[in-house]
Interface confidence: medium
C-alpha cells in the first residue's frame, strides 16, 4: 500500500513539474516573440523569407515556423485547459 501511495504521489509530483516546465517554456517562447528569421508577424517592410534565407541555412524555415507555432498553440492549449480545470474545481468547493 505504501508503494502504491508513493507511486501516486510521484505521479502527481511529476505532473506538477511538467506543468511548471510547460509554463516556463511557454513564457520563454512568448517573451522571445516570433523569431525574426521565421517571418512570423512580419509587416510589409520586412524582408521576404527567401531573402533572409539566402545563405541557405534553413531551407525548411516555413515548416519550422509552423512547428514552432504548433508548440506555442499546444502549450497554450494545455495550460489553458489546466487553468480552466482549476477554476472549475474551485467553483465546486
Amino acid at each position: 500500500r505504501r508503494d502504491v501511495a508513493h507511486g501516486i504521489l510521484n505521479e502527481a509530483y511529476r505532473k506538477v513539474l511538467d506543468q511548471l516546465s510547460a509554463g516556463k517554456h511557454l513564457q520563454s517562447l512568448v517573451a522571445r516573440g516570433v523569431g525574426g528569421s521565421l517571418g512570423g508577424g512580419a509587416g510589409d517592410d520586412a524582408e521576404p523569407l527567401s531573402k533572409r534565407h539566402s545563405d541557405g541555412i534553413f531551407t525548411d524555415s516555413y515548416s519550422r515556423y509552423r512547428k514552432q507555432m504548433a508548440v506555442k498553440k499546444y502549450l497554450a492549449a494545455v495550460l489553458g485547459k489546466r487553468y480552466k480545470q482549476r477554476v472549475k474545481n474551485k467553483g465546486r468547493r
Partner: antibody, heavy 116, light 110 residues
Amino acid sequence: SVEESGGRLVTPGTPLTLTCTVSGFSLSTYNMCWVRQAPGKGLEWVGFINSDDSAYYASWAKGRFTFSKTSTTVDLKIASPTTEDTATYFCARYDWDYYYSRLDLWGPGTLVTVSS
Amino acid sequence: DIVLTQTPASVSAAVGGTVSISCQSSESVYNNNYLSWFQQKPGQPPKLLIYGASTLASGVPSRFEGSGSGTQFTLTISDVQCDDAATYYCLGDYIIIENIFGGGTEVVVK
C-alpha cells in the same frame, strides 16, 4: 545596420538615454538586445526588447535600466547612473527560432563615462 | 544565479596549430543548444562565429567549430591564423529569459 548614439560623460545620478537606430530590417519582426562592456572587462548582457515591445532585463539590471522603442529606434535609459555603469554600450539584433538564438548584427557601440 | 564558466582565461597558439576553448554552464541552456560564440578584437564590437552550439555564422571560416550540448560546450579553432588573435566569448541563452556571457578567453597567436 545598427548604430548606437548618446554616449557621453555624465555625473553620477544624471539620467542618460542611449539610442540604437536600425535600418534594413523591421523592429516589428526582430528583438533587440543591449550588451555592455566596462573598459578592459568582459561582455555583460543587459536585456532585450522584443518585437511586441515587451522588455526583459538581466536580474542585476532590473530597475536600473528601461528599454523603449519606436519603429526604427530602440532606447536604453539609465535612470540614475553610477560609476559602475561606465562602459561601452552595444545594441545587437537578437534573432531566434525554435532551434537557435543568435546576436547576429551589432552596432559599433557608444561610450558612457560616469564620473564626478 | 546561473554561472557560465569559460576556460582557459588565456591561451597561446602557434600559427597552424589548434586551440580549444571550453564553456561550462551551471544550468542547461535553452533547448540544450542556445549557445553562441563570439570573437572580439580591441575597439570593435563582438562578431558572431557560432550559434545554436554548432552552426557556423555566415562568412565565418570552417576552421572554427562549435560542439556540445546542455551544459558543456567547446569552440575549436584549427589551423590557427594570425588574424585569429582576439578575445572569444560564449553566450548562453536560458529558459528563464536571461542571457549570460562567459568571462572570455584571450587567444594569443605566436
